[in-house]
């Protein structure tokens, strides 16, 4: 059962796993949610009746029954983890805590103009978990405006104390706001020879990389595959760090793989969700339950629905035994990973999908697409919406993309003559315009947010957000697309598609069926040569064939330029402008979405 509210002046008795320090009960709940075993917590707020050494303690708790006895205690705030909830979860914490000093290892000290600048510095520093900033009112003159970057083994403070005229806060890496590089490559036959901060068992290098990503201290990893010569080290995932943030030594070793934390790309690829099945593989761990199940998929479902289950092993039924049902072993461990991995015993193993809700919805794999042809099929581009105006009569105005359950990203120039959001309708999950009838459900628009610096499409800033009046329930036919990570600025996208209901030639009409075209990206240098009278800025991105023939056109405006990278679709561009349509040596010009990620997050995460 999902319980989100906090219980004031209440303490849960027993069940302690560990104690951490957090600046608020709200953040204690987030820490509990991300901890592999925590189901409940008790936080102690600052209070004259409490011993100051106990202020800000966050006691993480577990219970076989998923609840614990409650005791009244002043200043105690208790609650449940969000593991039991189905809603999207985020570790992003933008709060600034006034007059609190969050203790940790102070590894960097510098002058900053503001707490915001200090927080940005922390977000863009590979080691930083949180910071404390001494304001200009701080009593000690030499410490004023000093920004202390801090880290700890757990990613949370080792202690929190009251201190006048300082402010503290956390890195915004988990808010997708870091400019650090996103290195997705996994390097085969490579060992990183730096210090290990932890080690866990993992079935493959991808799971190892994802574990590294949400481990607070891990910057890179080395994984020993099941063919690794030393048997005791097979399937071992070594979580590593270094002072520089990069591996100091790379050793060539067969059957080992190495890679980097995906911290700076976590909003555009799954880092919590281990959805694969591992055949002929047994995961060992503490047994939670043994249940009969028809298949390994059914076993995974059972594990996902059991809040304490972290991973499972399914042993298929022996012929005609137990109505064809096999045994499903639901398991857990102290760190969420198997204590040992065995091969050759015929089991099928995997992980709970409960953690998938900690990943961005946009990373969910969508139905395989039918390549070739220009008409799309249903569910092929589930983020694509058609934006209609109802004034003076109803018609398709522009395309747009679902980027959140209340947000559509589109182009600013679409709103020429639109004097009120009341005349707009957003239709999602649509393949053919002819599906839209009087009674077709739509999303009303609460607010149109146009970039302040937009003047005309050709000079850039051609970007707008629509805040919907109601939230979108994600399904196979309507779901969000990932924004590109700022750390992905140097990625070369090779699988890009433009979609829309726009014209198929310059003098035409809106198409009934959603059209698609695969279009290669063009460098800004090349694009600038094709548009000598314009300034093609880094905030624009171009796509097109040298010979022309395929392009976006009138009516496609505001729609997505979607690029697939590492099996995840990213909203790389917004259809903006171009000379004619599909002309030779005249690529289409798109708004370069990665350059507006900060703007998008600022507007969509505003309180």
């Amino acid at each position: 059962e999902c319980v989100t509210q906090l219980l004031k002046d209440t303490c849960f008795e027993g069940g302690d796993i560990t104690t951490v320090f957090t600046p608020s009960a709200k953040y204690c709940q987030v820490v509990c949610t991300y901890h592999p075993r925590c189901l409940l917590f008790t936080f102690t707020a600052e209070s004259p009746s409490e011993d100051p050494t106990r202020w800000f303690t966050c006691v993480l708790k577990d219970s076989v029954t998923e609840t614990l006895p409650r005791v009244n205690r002043t200043a105690a705030i208790s609650g449940y983890s969000f593991k039991q909830c189905s809603h999207q979860i985020s570790a992003c914490n933008k709060d600034i805590y006034v007059d609190l000093d969050m203790k940790g290892i102070n590894y960097n000290s510098s002058v900053a103009k503001s707490a915001q600048e200090c927080q940005e510095r922390c977000t863009d520093d590979v080691h930083c978990h949180f910071f404390t900033y001494a304001t200009r009112q701080f009593p000690s003159l030499e410490h004023r405006n000093i920004c202390l970057l801090k880290h700890t083994q757990t990613g949370t403070p080792t202690r929190i104390t009251k201190l006048d005229k300082v402010v503290s806060g956390f890195s915004l890496k988990s808010c997708a706001l870091s400019n650090l590089a996103c290195i997705r490559d996994i390097f085969p036959n490579t060992v990183f020879a730096d210090s290990n901060i932890d080690s866990v068992m993992a079935p493959d290098a991808f799971v190892c990389g994802r574990i590294c990503t949400h481990h607070p201290g891990c910057l890179f990893f080395t994984f020993f595959s099941q063919e690794w010569p030393k048997e005791s080290q097979r399937n071992l995932c070594l979580l590593k760090t270094s002072e520089s943030g990069l591996p100091s030594t790379r050793i060539k070793k067969s059957k080992a793989l190495s890679g980097f934390s995906l911290q700076s790309c976590r909003h555009s690829i799954p880092v919590f969700c281990h959805s694969s099945f591992y055949h002929d593989t047994d995961f060992l761990g503490e047994e939670l339950d043994i249940v009969a199940a028809k298949s390994h998929e059914a076993c995974q479902k059972l594990c996902t629905n059991a809040v304490r289950c972290q991973f499972f092993t399914y042993t298929p039924a022996q012929a005609s035994c137990n109505e064809g049902k096999g045994k499903c072993y639901l398991k857990l461990s102290s760190n969420g990973s198997p204590t040992k991995i065995l091969h050759g015993r015929g089991g099928i193993s995997g992980y709970t999908l409960r953690l998938c809700k900690m990943d961005n919805e946009c990373t969910t794999k969508i139905k395989p697409r039918i390549v070739g042809g220009t008409a799309s099929v249903r569910g092929e581009w589930p983020w694509q919406v058609t934006l209609h105006t109802t004034s003076p009569t109803q018609r398709h105005l522009c395309g747009g993309s679902i980027i959140g359950n209340q947000w559509i990203l589109t182009a600013a120039h679409c709103f020429y003559g639109v004097e009120s959001p009341k005349i707009l309708r957003v239709y999602s999950g649509i393949l053919n315009q002819s599906e839209i009838k009087e009674d077709t459900s739509f999303f009303g628009v609460q607010e149109i947010i146009i970039h302040d610096q937009y003047k005309m499409a050709e000079s850039g800033y051609d970007i707008a957000l629509l805040k919907l009046e109601t939230t979108v329930n994600y399904t196979d036919s309507q779901r969000p697309i990932c924004l590109p990570s700022k750390g992905d600025r140097n990625v070369i996208y090779t699988d890009c598609w433009v979609t829309g209901w726009g014209y198929r030639k310059l003098r035409d009409k809106i198409q009934n069926t959603l059209q698609k075209a695969k279009i290669p990206l063009v460098t800004n240098e090349e694009c600038q040569k094709r548009y000598r009278g314009h300034k093609i800025t880094h905030k624009m991105i171009c796509a097109g064939y040298r010979e022309g023939g395929k392009d976006a056109c009138k009516g496609d405006s505001g729609g997505p330029l979607s690029c697939k990278h590492n099996e995840v679709w990213h909203l790389v561009g917004i259809t903006s402008w171009g000379e004619g349509c599909a002309q030779r040596e005249r690529p289409g010009v798109y708004t370069n979405v990665v350059e507006y990620v900060d703007w998008i997050l600022e507007k969509t995460q505003a309180v």
Epitope: Y416, I450, D452, A457, K554, S557, W577, G578, E579, V589
Partner: antibody
């Protein structure tokens, strides 16, 4: 409701600077663009320039060397200055608000007549 | 700068009859973003101008449906299906595709 009101001296001497203020209400200058348009007596409309909502300005090329548009967002005012005026600058001066984008002009002030004469 | 030429400059019409005003541009008004930033304004005697149409043919709310617009590229037309006495005034086309923005010289519609 949305209102724009032009104000300023009705008479300006040749070679002096014409100064007008457009005071707005019912909307923010950081959300909408404001244009200046003029109309000499018995003649057509002439676009003078725009104060974009981000504070940038853009002017009619024939007036560019003489015109300055500025704003004071705290007072909800946009100002027009036209230097070195001649009798040809005698006109009714309008301020108008752009739409969600630059245009169309969805709201207009009632206009103020400025006569250039010694 | 873009020059907009309106014809006729004066248009006497009998009430109930149709009327048509042409606006020709010195260069195409089709923007590279797909929009055509061509608008029509009416200035009634002693009043400020008011917008009738934007994007060639789109009526703003409150504008009677007897007003319609058509055209593309450089040639545009405003049509009034049946002129009424309240339609008297000066009609201006206006372009915002190319800076600096420009008005046509105006067409005076009067009742015969």
């Amino acid at each position: 409701q949305v209102q724009l009101q032009e104000s300023g001296p009705g008479l300006v001497k040749p070679s002096e600077t014409l100064s007008l203020t457009c005071t707005v209400s019912g909307f923010s200058l950081t959300t909408y663009h404001v244009h200046w348009v003029r109309q000499p007596p018995g003649k057509g409309l002439e676009w003078i320039g725009i104060m974009w909502r981000d504070g940038d300005t853009y002017y009619n090329s024939s007036l560019k060397s003489r015109v300055t548009i500025s704003r004071d967002t705290s007072k909800n005012q946009v100002s027009l200055k036209l230097s070195s005026v001649t009798a040809a600058d005698t006109a009714v001066y309008f301020c108008a608000r752009g739409g969600t984008l630059t245009t169309p002009f969805t709201y207009w002030g009632q206009g103020t007549l400025v006569t250039v004469s010694s | 700068d873009v020059v907009l030429t309106q014809t006729p400059l004066s248009l006497p019409v009998t009430p109930g009859e149709p009327a048509s005003i042409s606006c020709r541009s010195s260069q195409s008004l089709e923007s590279r973003d797909g929009n055509t930033y061509l608008e029509w304004y009416l200035q009634k005697p002693g009043q400020s101008p008011q917008v009738l149409l934007y994007g060639v043919s789109n009526r703003l709310s409150g504008v009677p449906d007897r007003f319609s617009g058509s055209g593309s590229g450089t040639d545009f037309t405003l049509k009034i299906s049946r002129v009424e006495a309240e339609d008297v005034g000066v009609y201006y086309c206006f372009q915002a595709t190319h800076g600096p923005f420009t008005f046509g010289q105006g067409t005076k519609l009067e009742i015969k």
